[in-house]
């Protein structure tokens, strides 16, 4: 069954945590649907963003942070492991120094920590996708 | 009650026709939600687009056409009559020489015809909005 989109969930992250998302683009890649995953510092959607991950399917991925309301230096990748019309599984792992983004089991993107992952309080998944799975796994202490 | 998004409806347009859309952005303007309305030449979403109208709420509007699979010269406007968090009523009227876009009763954008409006067979409304009304009115002959 489908999860609502935008999908928002409270989350606490630290090294070892992984966020897993399963979904499907709502349009063909020719029409450039988007997927966005934002790690927020508060439960409010206007809050700062520790890690912003935006896919323009078929074109590019941009990653960034939003600090005190201002977007910082954007990181762009043309790597496009997503398949037109196909379901995807996205996992974002918190490594000691960066986020590692896997797409369908394949390491696809990294983003160096600018803000501590411990500052994350909420994850939002949204834009032009249907969502079937959202999970945050925590490293067993 | 809400209409599904993406929302797709068969439509025949000519001078005097008006497409009316009521909806609301799904996110605050800080997060740059989008609204897109596309007038397609076929019932298929991969088909050419006679009139492409995309709002990046709080930032800008772009208009274009997609002909034989290729995007043409983009027209951009910084005019932003949409209100953060507020419902909007959008009406697109087919004039003899152009499309006229009204936002909340105020003439806000125009786009000269590149392809005859009679080539339109389908209208799609999508991206980051909830949709409460979609109507195509035809001029009585």
């Amino acid at each position: 069954s489908l999860l609502p989109v935008p999908y928002t969930e409270a989350a606490s992250l630290s090294t070892g945590s992984t966020v897993t998302i399963k979904g499907r683009p709502l349009a063909c890649f020719l029409n450039e649907p988007y997927l966005q995953v934002d790690f927020h510092t508060e439960m409010k959607e206007e809050s700062d963003i520790v890690f912003h991950f935006q896919v323009c399917f078929g074109r590019r991925v941009v990653m960034n942070s939003r600090e005190y309301g201002a977007w910082k230096q954007q990181v762009e990748s043309k790597n496009m492991p997503f398949q037109d019309g196909q379901e995807f599984e996205l996992s974002i792992s918190v490594l000691p120094d960066k986020y590692q983004v896997m797409v369908n089991g394949q390491s696809s993107y990294t983003f160096d920590h600018r803000i501590k992952p411990e500052a994350v309080k909420m994850v939002q998944v949204w834009r032009d996708i249907s969502l079937t799975k959202f999970n945050v796994s925590y490293l067993k202490r | 009650s809400l209409l599904p998004v993406p929302y797709t409806e068969a439509a025949s347009l000519s001078t005097g026709s008006t497409v009316t859309i009521k909806g609301r952005p799904l996110a605050c303007f800080l997060n740059e939600p989008y609204l897109q309305v596309d007038f397609h030449t076929e019932m298929k979403e991969e088909s050419d687009i006679v009139f492409h109208f995309q709002v990046c709420f709080g930032r800008r509007v772009v208009m274009n056409s997609r002909e034989y699979g290729a995007w043409k010269q983009q027209v951009e406007s910084k005019n932003m009559p949409f209100q953060d968090g507020q419902e909007f009523e959008l009406s697109i009227s087919v004039l003899p020489d152009k499309y006229q876009v009204m936002v909340n009763g105020q003439s806000s954008y125009t786009f000269d015809h590149r392809i005859k409006p009679e080539a339109v067979k389908m209208v799609q409304v999508w991206r980051d909005i909830s949709l409460t009304k979609f109507n195509v009115s035809y001029l009585k002959r």
Epitope: T41, K72, D97, D112, H113, R114, I115, K116, A119 | -
Partner: antibody, heavy 124, light 107 residues
């Protein structure tokens, strides 16, 4: 061996201008963000400005905004700081520094290599 | 005026543990870096991302942070560790700010 060598310092009158240069060698200069940090005589370190690897994005401390301009020439492996409307309080040793690992400035990783500095004296 | 507050001096005996604090930063959000500066020399990065050591920095240097305070710890301080130490964090990730500096003495 990685080296950063600053030059262009000297004596200038208040209201005057100076252009500092930092010649980089021993690493792929065009891949790293760079920064200018200054230290007034007997005082602590003060961040002045930074620039991303391509030169398209810059940042400035409030104390120098509108007066100083950072730039770089990746073909010449050189970082610059154009200083205008100099004030007595701008008098300091100016260091150029390389960010540890990213092409954009990221304070999380610090600055891992510094030049020896060049002294700017502002006096009438 | 430094936004990050450090003690102006910390005294430690040879072989003992020195702790230098840095207060006033948003260390719940931003990481701390630490620099060592000896007279007439350029600063040297000794800790970044709160607790990471660059290659070539002795293991006796360690770092931590909690709340509004970051701490540099030198376990078994050596004579060559006598120097000024500066903490650095971010007003934002791309905007560095330094503490006022701490002189480590007694060695």
């Amino acid at each position: 061996e990685l080296q950063l060598v600053e030059s262009g310092g000297g004596l200038v009158q208040p209201g005057g201008s100076l252009r500092l240069s930092c010649a980089a060698s021993g690493f792929t200069f065009s891949s790293y963000a760079m920064s200018w940090v200054r230290q007034a005589p007997g005082k602590g370190l003060e961040w002045v400005s930074n620039i991303n690897s391509g030169g398209g994005s810059t940042g400035y401390a409030d104390s120098v905004k509108g007066r100083f301009t950072i730039s770089r020439d990746n073909a010449k492996n050189t970082l610059y700081l154009q200083m205008n409307s100099l004030k007595p309080e701008d008098m300091a040793v100016y260091y150029c520094a390389k960010y540890l690992r990213t092409y954009y400035p990221n304070a999380a990783f610090g600055m891992d290599y510094w030049g020896k500095g060049t002294l700017v004296t502002v006096s009438s | 005026q430094a936004v990050l507050t450090q003690p102006s001096a910390v005294s430690v005996s040879l072989g003992q543990t020195a702790r230098i604090t840095c207060q006033g930063g948003n260390f719940g959000r931003y990481y701390a870096s630490w620099y060592q500066q000896k007279p007439g020399q350029a600063p040297v990065l000794v800790i970044y991302r709160d607790s990471e050591r660059p290659s070539g920095i002795p293991e006796r240097f360690s770092g931590s942070s909690s709340g509004d305070t970051a701490t540099l710890t030198i376990s078994g301080a050596q004579a060559e560790d006598e120097a000024d130490y500066y903490c650095q964090s971010g007003r934002s990730s791309d905007n560095a700010v330094f503490g006022g500096g701490t002189h480590l003495t007694g060695l």
